[in-house]
């Protein structure tokens, strides 16, 4: 049985302020059962960027349809990027439970924000 891998192919992404950033994440298995969530930063101070349960997250859209079955693409797009969005973004698989527990994280994608072209 294949062990779950979380693939964040881009080590870094650079986006001009005001544009959108696409953060790529794919997984290799539907197991373990449980949700994917996106965070900026690591540790206790990390910030939730997107999950299906909370929100709304008005600047975040999913690249794949949220109703797609057996989907393995959990990439997101963040619109209207500002310097405050800079940081490292992690795609994280949680194991279903009470509560859900973190199972595995992608390696992270560092988002840097360039000044808006004048």
């Amino acid at each position: 049985e294949e062990e779950l891998q979380i693939i964040q192919p881009d080590k870094s992404v650079s986006v001009a302020a005001g544009e959108s950033a696409i953060l790529h994440c794919t997984i290799t298995s539907l197991f373990p059962v449980g949700p994917i969530q996106w965070f900026r930063g690591a540790g206790p101070a990390r910030v939730l960027i997107y999950n299906q349960r909370q929100g709304p997250f008005p600047r975040v859209t999913t690249v794949s349809e949220t109703t797609k079955r057996e989907n393995m693409d959990f990439s997101i797009s963040i619109s209207n990027i500002t310097p405050a969005d800079a940081g490292t973004y992690y795609c994280i698989k949680f194991r279903k439970g009470s509560p859900d527990t973190e199972f595995k994280s992608g390696a992270g994608t560092e988002l840097s924000v360039r000044a808006k072209p004048s």
């Epitope: 049985e1 539907l30 197991f31 797609k68 693409d73 959990f74």
Partner: antibody
Framework: DVQLLESGGGVVQPGGSLRLSCAAS????????MTWVRQAPGEGLEWVST??????YYADSVKGRFTISRDNSKNTLYLQMNSLRAEDTAVYYC???????????????WGLGTLVTVSS | EIVLTQSPATLSVSPGERATFSCRAS??????LAWYQQRPGQAPRLLIY???IRETGIPERFSGSGSGTEFTLTITSLQSEDFAVYYC??????????FGGGTKVEIK
Amino acid sequence: DVQLLESGGGVVQPGGSLRLSCAASGFSFSNFAMTWVRQAPGEGLEWVSTIGSGDTYYADSVKGRFTISRDNSKNTLYLQMNSLRAEDTAVYYCAKDSTVSWSGDFFDYWGLGTLVTVSS
Amino acid sequence: EIVLTQSPATLSVSPGERATFSCRASQNVKNDLAWYQQRPGQAPRLLIYAARIRETGIPERFSGSGSGTEFTLTITSLQSEDFAVYYCQQYYDWPPFTFGGGTKVEIK
């Protein structure tokens, strides 16, 4: 075509045990979560248990008495039922889970069911 | 645990007519709701998932709508094979998965 075929049902006394099996074919069994749902005579549907790879989930009404397991080499799902009670009498259906990407699971294929009767 | 309440419990409809029945969730389940049909003596069959998406092979006369806590299944122009029991199921918050108590569609 996806096929799910349950077996192992029958009549058992209260406190007894049964093991149900569900033989699956027509899909990559090891890649999908699987579920047992039951239906008491003349009643509605009640979720019993779900298994992913090794992760298992149970309804409170069966927790500690029922054990779900799978053998991916045999494409077979199991439900070991111990300490059976009269209220466990039902048709037990095996179902294949389908996962919606950012969400949860529903059941896109069902077996025909096997009847378990708990009676003295 | 999220409780799903289906109404009416029984719906009497003439063949060719429209049938509409509802499923109400005790809390917000977004669009994470499925509908199943169960004919007498048969296993349930998936009709709709994500509140509105028809499963492959399900006729267009079946349609789902709603989100949050209020959902509706509509069958336009009932055929003889549509007389059955219909169940909703939420998969937003589990375990446990929960089902509604069912709506029986019978011939008027």
